[in-house]
Interface confidence: medium
Amino acid sequence: EICGPGIDIRNDYQQLKRLENCTVIEGYLHILLISKAEDYRSYRFPKLTVITEYLLLFRVAGLESLGDLFPNLTVIRGWKLFYNYALVIFEMTNLKDIGLYNLRNITRGAIRIEKNADLCYLSTVDWSLILDAVSNNYIVGNKPPKECGDLCPGTMEEKPMCEKTTINNEYNYRCWTTNRCQKMCPSTCGKRACTENNECCHPECLGSCSAPDNDTACVACRHYYYAGVCVPACPPNTYRFEGWRCVDRDFCANILSAESSDSEGFVIHDGECMQECPSGFIRNGSQSMYCIPCEGPCPKVCEEEKKTKTIDSVTSAQMLQGCTIFKGNLLINIRRGNNIASELENFMGLIEVVTGYVKIRHSHALVSLSFLKNLRLILGEEQLEGNYSFYVLDNQNLQQLWDWDHRNLTIKAGKMYFAFNPKLCVSEIYRMEEVTGTKGRQSKGDINTRNNGERASCESDVLHFTSTTTSKNRIIITWHRYRPPDYRDLISFTVYYKEAPFKNVTEYDGQDACGSNSWNMVDVDLPPNKDVEPGILLHGLKPWTQYAVYVKAVTLTMVENDHIRGAKSEILYIRTNASVPSIPLDVLSASNSSSQLIVKWNPPSLPNGNLSYYIVRWQRQPQDGYLYRHNYCSKDKIPIRKYADGTIDIEEVTENPKTEVCGGEKGPCCACPKTEAEKQAEKEEAEYRKVFENFLHNSIFVPRPE
């Protein structure tokens, strides 16, 4: 039977009975939070061969091996992952070995085996036979290998039964437990699976098969399963489903979303039966099973019961995520916050239409309204007293409304009101009148010319760049010296720069009044010589990266109406030079004949330019005659067994410092001090562990159902 849409077994080990008839779990399998140690020996699920998503084990007391529970689990497809992982074994206090001796393939995703204090037989499994890339595997904080003394079948009797492979330059036997070898197929099978008798399966099989070269005898399918056969693609009038099988239209029409029991059900799109239309598409009618492309962002209508939605925090803005049409009024009152501009853009950036009015007051954290980056229509169906549909009052740091060169905003009905916005230039308000079509609607007192813009550089002159020079990680720029009417009023310049993959940034992007700013800022003092052009060297930049740069003059000059006069440049886009790329990732080599090696790799994470070719070098190595590290028949050589505490053991990472060679001299000495890079890597590692653990806890701890 196919079980799904994901099975969560927690608290009571007897819930395992739910797996009794499952051959495939279409979805994930969680076994977790079973705090009372139980005897699992009577539980055995030999029918289970495939999990289409991931397997997660967390805090299951008393479980010592997975081999008895799932003796025939062959494939974990990883169609959906748990934080990039297809197999997670975390804080399993009593687990002694994984023991999944029939596990042959993890199709997508990595493995994370962490904080399992008694877990051995980890170094004896060659994960590269199961996964495509092992570089993302995370295996830490388990029982140290030195304390495990893992022995593969037959080793003690000097009749080893398992095959050998090389991991980290160590050629050794591969097994899951003391009596189960890791299965390997003959090299003649290449990438194909094989039967228990080492006959090669059909190319469409994955993991194993019950008969050779037969696409109906596969344990699992490499691509898709349909009507008892493994097929490379779904036949006509059938659709890919959950990443592993083909279903017909009727089947797709007949299933419900796992998340909701609404009537919409699944859709067919791009040859796949899926829960929802993908991003950028919408159903062709509410009862339709088909998707059509959206024009612009896909519409999502959001409504406020109380008519007026108050946005006074990121949390309240979160409710509007994905909304394109807001039925009601928006009252924005953001007095403080962290990284507020980008958070608001994240949650409100798709709103295109507000049917009522928009009121922004006491929002001292806002520098710009550009977070409403798609707002194009305020209908003004409901208005504030005085017939206002756009009302901006007492926002101490508001400097920009929108970038009017790239913004079409219409206010269909109602007037605008602006007062006590000391950093908002009146010219910016007048520009809004023109763009929105409200010019002539406002009466004289609606736009206050004295208390709007009273503390801003409203009369801006343009600064011009005079030269730019680039290297791989530096940019040197100079600009014309700005001469205000009184030279003594020029204090300094501020250079703003940031990475800008596209030429679409504005001065106010990601900026708020609480210190968050996506721009890096550098102050530049005036050159002492009046004839020297001011300039700056920006260093520590990334190679082959486009940066946006602009400069502002900091002045004191007052002009008419006591408004400050200032100067700033246009935004300049400039790319650093190319550099040497970082190393290629996930290098794998395998032999497919006696005279050939196949080498695969992924591109470098930092290409630092346009990659044009790779250089592959190889050399012949002498045969490695592997010696046993321990003579297990000699009493004094058996490693001391001590119970690991499940914390990350430093010995796994660094060797004994007393035997380290430092400064080119041999002999005992102190460990070399860690480099800054090593310290940073350790810090990032610790951070990554925390992030994963938080993700795990947030995912699995759920409120008890009512």
Partner: antibody, heavy 123, light 112 residues
Framework: EVQLQQSGPELVKPGASVRISCKAS????????MNWVKQSHGKSLEWVAN????????NYNQKFKDKATLTVDKSSNTAYMELRSLTSEDTAVYYC????????????????WGTGTLVTVSS | DVLMTQTPLSLPVSLGDHASISCRSS???????????LEWYLQKPGQSPKLLIY???NRFSGVPDRFSGSGSGTDFTLKISRVEAEDLGVYYC?????????FGGGTKLEIK
């Protein structure tokens, strides 16, 4: 085209047994339960039982537990219902109807019905 | 067993009229997951039954929008807004929530 083709009418003697068939075409046979429904002349419909073609697992209406036995032949995409110890009460049209086999996520309905097989029990 | 009681047994209508059929279950047919598997089928003379409505109110594909279902718990209704000649036949409600699954006694929609 999705079809459930049932075997022809049967005339059987009281006390005897009969096996009627339902051949599925146009869809993946193992993706759906096969249900059997009884309709006596001029009467309402009664659900008899269903079978999971993957493993032969069955659910019966207790009323028919000793009357009907369901089987499938996956190789020919055919479901069978055997009726035993027949009496005049068993005279009826028997329909097969498919029902999606998908735990926890299906809308559960009989979307395709067979043509019906009339079983007449008479001496 | 869950008993499904349909009323009326017979419903004479004129073409273009509205029609309403009621179905009552002897106990709640709401499943533990909150879903209610209540369906309506139409059987025309000499034919197999055909699905009209599933899960109380959802029209099956190809079913005209003049058919609508409503109800909750134990009381359910099928409405036909403007009866057409092709709508004549016997209507059955069906519960698929509890084994054994059961049909209502049927309501015959006929011309006055």
């Amino acid at each position: 085209e999705v079809q459930l083709q049932q075997s022809g009418p049967e005339l059987v003697k009281p006390g005897a047994s009969v096996r009627i068939s339902c051949k599925a075409s146009g869809y993946a046979f193992t993706d759906y339960y096969m249900n059997w429904v009884k309709q006596s002349h001029g009467k309402s419909l009664e659900w008899v039982a269903n079978i999971n073609p993957n493993n032969g697992g069955t659910n019966y209406n207790q009323k028919f537990k000793d009357k009907a036995t369901l089987t499938v032949d996956k190789s020919s995409n055919t479901a069978y219902m055997e009726l035993r110890s027949l009496t005049s009460e068993d005279t009826a049209v028997y329909y097969c109807a498919r029902w999606i086999l998908y735990y926890g996520r299906s809308k559960w309905y009989f979307d395709v019905w067979g043509t019906g097989t009339l079983v007449t029990v008479s001496s | 067993d869950v008993l499904m009681t349909q009323t009326p047994l017979s419903l004479p209508v004129s073409l273009g009229d509205h029609a309403s059929i009621s179905c009552r279950s002897s106990q709640s047919i709401v499943q533990s997951n909150g879903d209610t598997y209540l369906e309506w089928y139409l059987q025309k003379p000499g034919q197999s039954p055909k699905l009209l409505i599933y899960r109380i109110s959802n029209r099956f594909s190809g079913v005209p929008d003049r058919f609508s279902g409503s109800g909750s718990g134990t009381d359910f209704t099928l409405k036909i807004s403007r009866v057409e000649a092709e709508d004549l036949g016997v209507y059955y409600c069906f519960q698929g929530s509890h084994v054994p699954y059961t049909f209502g006694g049927g309501t015959k929609l006929e011309i006055k």
